[in-house]
């Protein structure tokens, strides 16, 4: 099975300058169990929550967000309105965090290309935002023997690159698509894909699954997703998510067990994955 | 264990103000929004709005606007109801509730009478 | 906003016999892009703030007895209680879960026979 990767993409309407589209989705046999977006950087690192998406127990969403929902069972969008004449939103980054079982939570951001000319498509530029925070678990030297490591992967996979794939296109004829393109995959490289972002964050899946403020619940009833394009597209990784860091509160409240065990609701760090009891609101 | 601690019943005069407290434990306080419900003697549940801590960011009931104010205070973890211009139809009971209404405080009930 | 009617808004039922509530919304709850209905049942006692039973129209929450069940899909939905226990008796209340505001139905009030 491929790793899974994170796309964002982010479009200014041509009805409406003001308006801009964030269309977000997971590539990976996972099931989603909840899907945050934030501007202004990642969802715990400087960022501001625009939405949260659960695909059951429903959707919140919070100014200038104006509508979130699920456009199919792995991918999302959500409208925003900028009512500024400045439009802030044009050099504002995206970010959406996918929360799914097994793989975890994994994360990427995007942005509007600074200049996008109606009616042109920017090429993709993604926002790599690969956090500190794991050099500090690993040590200087864990770091280098690990970019030695996936240097010599590198160097093999370019023998066996696989097909490029298609970006997914959420355009029409009516908007002007400024897209930024932000794919997330650990096994996926830079150097041989440059509109490729590392996987920004990973939060490795516990048998614990996780509600979006930290209450997690185990599985109860198994909700498949079905696979996308990149999880057929096998290509060989040292380690899940071992160039990935891991989100701040994995470690500090990871023992907490709160309301109910068992199947039900149970605390968990900040690291809001894998899998978070499978159902509430929709489109708010 | 996570748990939603509100403040005790009050009663109030028509056209004061009331402030309900909500305390919450056991979980990431700033991570997901707080909501708050009324639900009148006999009567069914009614949605007036919710806050997201962690940015202050709202969203209020339409009918409400102008008369509740929704706010939070992550140092204490606690999130805070406020409605004005009460009316004898505003007696009820208040519930704040979080995580898409999985969990509930115990209620305040708020009486108007002159 | 989204209306919530609840049918009925009363009944009574025999001890290990079937409760049914209905619940029609005045605009679909199924979202296309996922195929999932957004819809919640909670339980409320005398006394005690409501209590989260069913969400997505089907899911069962954590601890909830499997003699309760959710259907539907679109605007009719049901809760079911297969076999009643002396327990249940409550106020039973739908919920639109689709689109802001959240608004919930009138709520059926279920007692023993």
């Known amino acids: 099975a491929g790793t899974p990767e994170v796309w964002v993409q982010v479009q200014m309407e041509a009805t409406e300058l003001s308006s801009f589209t964030v269309h977000c989705g997971f590539l990976g046999p996972g099931s989603i169990s909840l899907v945050t977006v934030s501007w202004g950087g990642p969802d715990g690192a400087g960022g501001t929550k625009l939405a949260v998406l659960h695909p059951e127990l429903g959707t919140r969403q919070w100014a200038p967000a104006r509508q979130a929902r699920w456009e199919t069972q792995s991918s999302i969008s959500l409208a925003l309105e900028d009512s500024g004449a400045s439009s802030p939103f044009a050099n504002t980054t995206f970010c959406c965090k996918f929360a799914s079982f097994p793989e975890g939570s994994w994360e990427s951001c995007g942005s509007l290309p600074p200049s996008s000319d109606p009616g042109l498509s920017a090429p993709p530029t993604p926002v790599p935002i690969l956090r500190a925070d794991l050099a500090g678990i690993l040590g200087l030297s864990g770091v280098l023997l690990f970019g030695c490591g996936y240097l010599l992967h590198l160097l093999r996979r370019q023998k066996h690159r696989p097909t490029p794939r298609l970006q997914p296109s959420h355009t029409n004829s009516q908007a002007l698509t400024a897209q930024a393109w932000a794919p997330s995959q650990a096994s996926q490289a830079a150097l041989h894909d440059p509109y490729a972002t590392i996987n920004t964050s990973f939060c490795p899946a516990t048998l614990d699954t996780a509600h979006p403020n930290g209450w997690a619940s185990l599985p109860t009833h198994a909700a498949h997703q079905p696979q996308g394009p990149a999880a057929s597209a096998s290509t060989p990784i040292l380690a899940r998510g071992s160039f990935v860091s891991v989100e701040n509160g994995l470690y500090t409240q990871a023992g907490e067990r709160p309301p109910h065990t068992g199947p039900g609701l149970t605390l968990f760090p900040d690291c809001r994955g894998p899998r978070a009891l499978e159902g509430r609101f929709g489109v708010r | 264990e996570v748990q939603l601690v509100q403040s005790g019943a009050e009663v109030k005069k028509p056209g004061s103000s009331v402030k309900v407290s909500c305390k919450a434990s056991?979980?990431?306080?700033?991570?997901?929004?707080i909501e708050w419900v009324r639900q009148a003697p006999g009567q069914g549940l009614e949605w007036m709005g919710e806050i997201l801590p962690g940015s202050n960011s709202t969203n209020y009931n339409e009918k409400f606007k102008g008369r509740v104010t929704i706010t939070a205070d992550e140092s204490t973890s606690t999130a805070y109801m406020e409605l004005s211009s009460l009316r004898s139809e505003d007696t009820a009971v208040y519930y704040c509730?979080?995580?898409?209404?999985?969990?509930w405080g115990q209620g305040t009930l708020v009486t108007v009478s002159s | 906003d989204i209306v919530m009617t609840q049918s009925p808004d009363s009944l009574a039922v025999s001890l290990g016999e079937r409760a049914t509530i209905n619940c029609k919304s005045s605009?679909?709850?199924?979202?296309?892009?996922?195929?999932?209905?957004?819809l919640a049942w909670y339980q409320q006692k005398p006394g005690q703030p409501p209590k989260l039973l069913i969400y997505?129209?089907?899911t069962r929450e954590s601890g909830v007895p499997d003699r309760f069940s959710g259907s539907g899909s679109g605007t009719d939905f049901t809760l079911t209680i297969s076999s009643l226990q002396a327990e249940d008796v409550a106020v039973y209340y739908c919920?639109?879960?689709?689109?802001?505001?959240?608004?919930f139905g009138q709520g059926t009030k279920l007692e023993i026979k």
């Open positions: 056991g979980g990431t306080f700033s991570s997901f929004s």
């Open positions: 509730s979080s995580y898409w209404f999985a969990y």
């Open positions: 605009q679909s709850l199924l979202n296309s892009g996922n195929q999932k209905n957004y």
């Open positions: 997505g129209a089907s």
């Open positions: 919920q639109n879960a689709h689109s802001y505001p959240p608004t």
